[in-house]
Amino acid sequence: MKENVASATVFTLLLFLNTCLLNGQLPPGKPEIFKCRSPNKETFTCWWRPGTDGGLPTNYSLTYHREGETLMHECPDYITGGPNSCHFGKQYTSMWRTYIMMVNATNQMGSSFSDELYVDVTYIVQPDPPLELAVEVKQPEDRKPYLWIKWSPPTLIDLKTGWFTLLYEIRLKPEKAAEWEIHFAGQQTEFKILSLHPGQKYLVQVRCKPDHGYWSAWSPATFIQIPSDFTMNDTTVWISVAVLSAVICLIIVWAVALKGYSMVTCIFPPVPGPKIKGFDAHLLEKGKSEELLSALGCQDFPPTSDYEDLLVEYLEVDDSEDQHLMSVHSKEHPSQGMKPTYLDPDTDSGRGSCDSPSLLSEKCEEPQANPSTFYDPEVIEKPENPETTHTWDPQCISMEGKIPYFHAGGSKCSTWPLPQPSQHNPRSSYHNITDVCELAVGPAGAPATLLNEAGKDALKSSQTIKSREEGKATQQREVESFHSETDQDTPWLLPQEKTPFGSAKPLDYVEIHKVNKDGALSLLPKQRENSGKPKKPGTPENNKEYAKVSGVMDNNILVLVPDPHAKNVACFEESAKEAPPSLEQNQAEKALANFTATSSKCRLQLGGLDYLDPACFTHSFH
């Protein structure tokens, strides 16, 4: 009887407690997934913080689905990662897939859910700390001692496949110091540290981080005692500094001493040449003399050498980055208009100093940055408004109407490259000197083309030879041009009608003014800045201004000879008016045929360079 009463009392009490306690409870609080990490992109673990338990036993479960899927999955492993965690093994881990996960907390009063967390394994990588951290004090002879630190990447990381790129960071501090000194080591697994305090005991640690992801924990600290006799032997350093200082001083003194003289003359004194005028282009072909001279403060003045007047006979055609021949009508850019280069309308092109034989450099040999395009960010632009109308100035047509000029606001005229026929070779700019030389001799017509800035001076008044026509020359030519807003915006390829030309004093270079169908070039000598007064185009000194292309030398130099038949023709504008085209053409053909035959016999081989014997020239001309 007593037992029944006792058990009934206990039962009632438990029932009361259960009822009362359950009444006072709440559903669980909201859990939070606070971290997901992968040590190696192959597995990952997520951890959550439980919310309040509501005073009741609460169960937690993690559910997830992959982006694009609706099927929910439950966490595969609640054990491996410890309490309140979910571990995803290899078979559950997919790269480049987003996992959408949520933790569910449930008790007798209800269920609560964490916010959804979006996880991409690529971005949650946190490697294990680096291993086998070794620290050593190295004290080489005659050099400052240093701390040498070496380590290995964490074992789970596969670095060989390129799947991973690990970056490392080292920190060290004297044992009793508060502040850590941090060094970034990049991808290397060893590091040298100088400037240590002798007699101190240092703590060294290393950690790593993948390209996307988090820094690992610091590796266990390694201790190293820095010896007290950790002295510096700076002899080598001082010797190096002294030598370097001496060299710098010598260079400065040398530069100052040579100021005002031609640097080139000092470095490469004039060597007596062969009988006729010519120069060895291979002499400076391999040296970057131009860069050296400008670095030392030497200006690009024309050299005062024995070769001052060579360019009257030898016209050098270069294909440096500063000079381009353009074919507007290419396959890539059909009928694309071109914006003129903004050059100062000055008649001095500056090519004499840039390309004089004494200053010939590697520049001509350098490959083009972009072989298929005319590269100048400010020069070529696709027209914003293709409908824009362009006006032609009727007075600006010369050369028998074949080369149109565009009006530049005043009476000045400038040439612009003509669009090529559609069957033309699609290259939009030439990059081969030999091709150009062939073109010059070849029968094809040659409209003028624009040259870019060369060296410091803009190329302001010159004209180069057009690239070859491979098919038949097309009769119709399509022309596009732009109306320049100011005179300054106009590139001057040809001088104005009334522009005076230089006297027959020693010349630096010549300017091409016309290319006939036969390849005859009209040349005008360019006057040096310090020369005397200019002479009018009609003067007798200008008689030798017309020349024929006689041949192309192996080193890509055009050989030009004076044309005796064109003696009374003063300038290209006047020649177009006065001389009948047929007569001029006839004379040109005869002279060219006569000279070409002779010149082949008169060629001498001198150290890989072709020279032409002037004696032969005179015979052929007589």
Epitope: C20, L22, G24, G55
Partner: antibody, heavy 116, light 110 residues
């Protein structure tokens, strides 16, 4: 008889504070979780806050988090709601309600009106 | 804006059966039990149904509740004029860590 009686409502300026009280009788107050629920004029019911039987767990609606504090004094069988930084949208009839073991509000007070 | 959706109004003639729906989502109705409250004009709310379909003592058996997935419904059969009131569904929302009430449904007995 099981009963809940609210007090402390009134007119208050925006940004002001007010403390509501709910006196419980007719049941073991310390064994139940207690709630505050409000109802704006002409609108529906909105749960405000809950406190567990011993005061260890408290949950708040997002709209009042950081401004309102729920508390209880089991020795006085009283539930409190401290309202700070009051806004016009807090204007409502405030009810205290008991939470039963099924997670339902089984006993409700008659409410106290708060006008901001 | 309530996380639980109820129709703003419902109506019926005496003796008729009326159903009020309440739809939610997985974090509330989908994973927790639904309660229904009745609020007569000018009075405090009163528990009508708890744990989806349980009636507290004193509530007539004309009131019944049900739940399916993320939706719940309250059915009133044999409609009477005293049933004219506002009805609310409520559930613990695990995402909000709090109780969510539906927007009120005003029942009119024609």
């Amino acid at each position: 008889e099981v009963q809940l009686l609210e007090s402390g409502g009134g007119l208050v300026q925006p940004g002001g504070s007010l403390r509501l009280s709910c006196a419980a009788s007719g049941f073991t107050f310390s064994s139940y979780s207690m709630n505050w629920v409000r109802q704006a004029p002409g609108k529906g019911l909105e749960w405000v806050a809950v406190i567990s039987y011993d005061g260890s767990n408290k949950y708040y609606a997002d709209s009042v988090k950081g401004r309102f504090t729920i508390s209880r004094d089991n020795s006085k069988n009283t539930l409190y709601l401290q309202m700070n930084s009051l806004r016009a949208e807090d204007t409502a009839m405030y009810y205290c309600a008991r939470l039963n073991r099924a997670g339902a509000f089984d006993i409700w007070g008659q409410g106290t009106l708060v006008t901001v | 804006q309530s996380v639980l959706t109820q129709p703003p109004s419902a109506s019926g003639t005496p003796g008729q059966r009326v159903t009020i729906s309440c739809s939610g989502r997985s974090s509330n109705i989908g994973s927790n039990t639904v309660n229904w409250y009745q609020q007569l004009p000018g009075t405090a709310p009163k528990l009508l149904i708890y744990k989806n379909n349980q009636r507290p003592s004193g509530v007539p058996d004309r009131f019944s509740g049900s739940k399916s997935g993320t939706s719940a419904s309250l059915a009133i059969s044999g409609l009477r004029s005293e049933d004219e009131a506002d009805y609310y569904c409520a559930v613990w929302d695990g995402s909000l860590s709090g109780w969510a009430f539906g927007g009120r449904t005003k029942l009119t007995v024609l």
